[in-house]
């Protein structure tokens, strides 16, 4: 039974040019994560391996950097960048847990991020 | 403490097989991966490859794929590693090593030589 | 594969000297970067990782710098124990690959 929970930064928005940390966190569940996809719609941005570490899609090495953690900082922003993102997290032996993010890249200054948590 | 005890040196005829052995102690052994690392003499390290003894999934380094298997016996906490078709360029100093924390190795064991001459 | 480039090969340096080794993948590893000593018929010690963290119990005249391509291993102030040979290992993404090695030796 899949008794665990992710949690993640929920909607958020930053401004184009700027950078921002994608996170999420799985609790409440004793399986072994194997590895975590981040997705952008149809798309793979980057795949962290437990056994074999990151690997960052050839399309957006020069935008995306791994971390912190199993996170995903995304660099250089642009409106383009707005969308759904989502943390797909492989375990053993539960299966597999989604989150998802919403993120809104601003034209302006008055970007705010939204609802925020302490990744432990 | 947490340590990691290799199997003795061999000596092998090219095209043998040699089975190298890693016995884990003081720490679970279900809880880190295991990693391969030769050393051919006067030269640098080389990964073969990682086995996670947990679910066991296994990774090998493409230039050894196809020659080498990596299994784990769970009830003695032992992992093996074993190369087939040797041929003289296999002689090396063969470590085990964990990656305790995240894909660098702070746990080696002390390292199994195995030279393959005719 | 990323292939890891360390200079110089090898140095020859006395008690005290302060001694830099570098470290150069051919591609952006970001911090993923770790370093180990190794003394003869002796399994590598790991002494660095995510290119500045110190290993539990390593000497604080040990120290690590620099992101992306360009990495520095310090020793400040070389003791008689530090006579060694140093590689470099990312651990950014499989396979992972180590550095040629540089080898400390005394002048």
């Known amino acids: 039974m899949m008794t665990g929970t992710i949690e993640t930064t929920g909607n958020i928005s930053a401004e184009k040019g700027g950078s921002i940390i994608l996170q999420c966190h799985l609790s409440s569940t004793t399986a072994q994560v194997t590895q975590v996809n981040w997705e952008q719609q149809d798309q793979l941005l980057a795949i962290c391996n437990a056994d074999l570490g990151w690997h960052i899609s050839p399309s957006f090495k020069d935008r995306v950097a791994p971390g912190p953690g199993l996170g995903l900082t995304l660099q250089s922003l642009t409106v383009n960048d707005t969308g759904e993102y989502f943390c797909i997290y492989h375990t053993y032996p539960d299966g597999t847990y989604t989150g998802r993010i919403f993120l809104e890249v601003l034209e302006s200054s008055v970007a705010e991020h939204g609802a925020r948590f302490q990744i432990p | 403490q947490l340590q990691l005890v290799q199997s003795g040196a061999e000596v092998k005829k090219p095209g043998a097989s040699v089975k190298v052995s890693c016995k884990a102690s003081?720490?679970?052994?279900?809880?880190?991966?295991m990693n391969w690392v030769r050393q051919a003499p006067g030269q640098s390290l080389e990964w073969i490859g990682v086995?996670?003894?947990?679910?066991?999934?296994?990774s090998y380094n493409q230039k050894f794929k196809g020659r080498v298997t990596m299994t784990r016996d769970q009830s003695t906490s032992t992992a093996y590693m074993e190369l087939n078709s040797l041929r003289s360029e296999d002689t090396a100093v063969y470590y085990c090593?964990?990656?305790?924390?995240?894909?660098?190795?702070?746990?080696w064991g002390q390292g199994t030589l195995v030279t393959v001459s005719s | 594969d990323i292939q890891m480039t360390q200079s110089p090969s090898s140095l020859s340096a006395s008690v005290g000297d302060r001694v830099t080794i570098t470290c150069r993948p051919s591609?952006?590893?970001?911090?993923?970067l770790a370093w180990y000593q190794q003394k003869p018929g002796k399994a590598p010690k790991l002494l660095v990782y995510?290119?500045?963290a110190l290993a539990e119990g390593v000497p604080s005249r040990f120290s690590g710098s620099g992101s992306g391509t360009d990495f520095t291993l310090t020793i400040s102030s070389l003791q008689p124990e530090d006579f060694a040979t140093y590689y470099c290992?990312?651990?950014?993404?499989?396979?992972?690959?180590f550095g040629q090695g540089t080898k400390v030796e005394i002048k």
């Open positions: 090593a964990n990656n305790w924390d995240v894909w660098y190795f702070d746990v």
């Open positions: 003081g720490y679970s052994f279900t809880d880190y991966n």
């Open positions: 086995i996670n003894p947990n679910h066991g999934t296994i």
């Open positions: 591609e952006n590893i970001y911090s993923y």
């Open positions: 995510n290119a500045k």
């Open positions: 290992q990312h651990h950014f993404g499989a396979p992972w690959t």
